[in-house]
Amino acid sequence: IPVIEPSVPELVVKPGATVTLRCVGNGSVEWDGPPSPHWTLYSDGSSSILSTNNATFQNTGTYRCTEPGDPLGGSAAIHLYVKDPARPWNVLAQEVVVFEDQDALLPCLLTDPVLEAGVSLVRVRGRPLMRHTNYSFSPWHGFTIHRAKFIQSQDYQCSALMGGRKVMSISIRLKVQKVIPGPPALTLVPAELVRIRGEAAQIVCSASSVDVNFDVFLQHNNTKLAIPQQSDFHNNRYQKVLTLNLDQVDFQHAGNYSCVASNVQGKHSTSMFFRVVESAYLNLSSEQNLIQEVTVGEGLNLKVMVEAYPGLQGFNWTYLGPFSDHQPEPKLANATTKDTYRHTFTLSLPRLKPSEAGRYSFLARNPGGWRALTFELTLRYPPEVSVIWTFINGSGTLLCAASGYPQPNVTWLQCSGHTDRCDEAQVLQVWDDPYPEVLSQEPFHKVTVQSLLTVETLEHNQTYECRAHNSVGSGSWAFIPISAGAHTHPPDEFLFTP
């Protein structure tokens, strides 16, 4: 490590004094200090002498001696005060530039250490510092504004009390630059554009940044467009806007448009697609099957996607029957816009009733005409079952009628004892009827089937049960023969004696 003579950390002299600073190292040494007049430098191998025979306040500062060949990079320093009664400050720079949140050193060096107690920092002309200005002072280095903010870009003066009066330094201009967090922010509107040939169109590309130094351009299918730029400044951001106005669009205007902005941090781009069409269009579609089956009492949402240009002039949901002339309640119809040209229309049908099965149509209109999309809604019902005893062609027959949707399957059971419902332990015999006779099968209605079980003689201590089931559920009816005739047992209902 080099050694400085005199071997003191600070040296205080008067103006006009002779000052000699000698630095000695193992190898060659170099001096570094504030730029100031009247110094002469004399080097002799491993020592270097810095001297002046007429010190001025401008020689105030820290002088550092380094040994370039030292791998540890050691250095020694001495601070020189030249205490001029008329000049308490030596300002090393009149402009300081920092980024926001950095510490800003205002390099006004005190020329007399005795004055340290009475120093303060003010804005020019004795005005107070901006509120919340945190600063500290070092007589060797000056005032440091900590974590400087953009608003603190001001002109400052260092103030010292000398003999009861304030003496100001020359002013120091602080420029606090906004930190550029990245490439400029971009907006390109609209995000998508459709026009009929001959119509007017506008595309706006705008970019903003905390710093004014950035470029923005609009390109069409990789061709940069020459558009006049508008500039603005608000909300502490610089804005540059490019507006493309097309009075009468044609097919060559269609395609991809990109808004591109760049600064020192990099580049941002965003794109949109412009479609030019010959005439108005209106397309209806659904992601759902147009034929819907729902269990009675449950709910259903019917959804239609609409793609249209120009916008819709009208739309509605209509019930086309067959059960009643009721129409969907408007409050159950909902419209959401996915984007400018695509919309979703939803009809909510909560807790469906039998009379609400049928056809529902969504109709929409724009200058391109009318379009409709129709859903067919069939309700599913669990089977309802009834059994009667009759004679067909002279033979005793049990006749089971089952009604439901989808078409029910029928199974006959014979079991011992009198019971409302046969259980496994009681079952004597089971007959499946794979092809019951279909009595009625109309669209949107239940399917009614009939199954016949010919019984030569009714066993009086036994029960005959007709069971029907489909994908929704099952139903059954128990028939109990008694001596006076026969009893039928609908589940959980009264006995019936024909």
Epitope: V122, R125, P128, L129, M130, D155
Partner: antibody
Framework: QVQLVQSGAEVKKPGASVKVSCKAS????????ISWVRQAPGQGLEWMGW????????NYAQKLQGRVTMTTDTSTSTAYMELRSLRSDDTAVYYC?????????????WGQGTLVTVSS | DIVMTQSPDSLAVSLGERATINCKSS????????????LAWYQQKPGQPPKLLIY???NRESGVPDRFSGSGSGTDFTLTISSLQAEDVAVYYC?????????FGPGTKVDIK
């Protein structure tokens, strides 16, 4: 609402000192500076100096330098002005005033004033 | 120091009439860096502290009636009361906050004729 409430009237002998207080309420005390302004009987207004309630930084009018000290107590949101070596021409109403929102030395709120009479 | 002078010393104006007060600074209080005039106007009624009316030479303080307006630039400024009301009887001061020490004018007393 913003209020600056000052201490009561004082009668002092020449050569004595006086310390006037100014209690602030209704705003964040440390966000604004306080100036002191005085008005001799029947006379105009004279700015005495300012203090930053944020960091205690002060700037006094040159003619009062060495005789005036301004301080703040942020725990009680109170500003103080002490004037030493009183003379008869220091007889005046002393006002504390809040610096403007802009941090410039004009005043949007004032205390009610404290009459200091210096008389032998 | 910047010396502020006001004219007239006093004036009497009929109710509903216009009152005009002038203020002159010994050097410009226009800051070229922000193009602002560092001048304020205050109203002081007897036994009360001053009340801020105008700042930056022409900006009316919140809650101040719009009959009060300020104008001027550089060294010459004017406070105008467009239609004097009884409650406007007071002493009016201009103040420069351009440079330390921040000085006030001597005041202009406004009365009703």
């Amino acid at each position: 609402q913003v209020q600056l409430v000052q201490s009561g009237a004082e009668v002092k002998k020449p050569g004595a000192s006086v310390k006037v207080s100014c209690k602030a309420s209704g705003y964040t005390f440390t966000s604004y500076g306080i100036s002191w302004v005085r008005q001799a009987p029947g006379q105009g207004l004279e700015w005495m100096g300012w203090i930053s309630a944020y960091n205690g930084n002060t700037n006094y009018a040159q003619k009062l330098q060495g005789r005036v000290t301004m301080t703040t107590d942020t725990s009680t949101s109170t500003a103080y002005m002490e004037l030493r070596s009183l003379r008869s021409d220091d007889t005046a109403v002393y006002y504390c005033a809040r610096e403007s929102w802009f941090g410039e030395v004009f005043f949007d709120y004032w205390g009610q004033g404290t009459l200091v009479t210096v008389s032998s | 120091d910047i010396v502020m002078t006001q004219s007239p010393d006093s004036l009497a104006v009929s109710l509903g009439e216009r009152a005009t007060i002038n203020c002159k600074s010994s050097q410009s209080v226009l800051d070229s860096s922000d193009n602002k005039n560092y001048l304020a106007w205050y109203q002081q009624k007897p036994g009360q502290p001053p009340k801020l009316l105008i700042y930056w030479a022409s900006n009316r303080e919140s809650g101040v009636p719009d009959r009060f307006s300020g104008s001027g630039s550089g060294t010459d400024f004017t406070l105008t009361i467009s239609s004097l009301q009884a409650e406007d009887v007071a002493v009016y001061y201009c103040q420069q906050y351009y440079s330390d020490p921040f000085t006030f004018g001597p005041g202009t007393k406004v009365d009703i004729k």
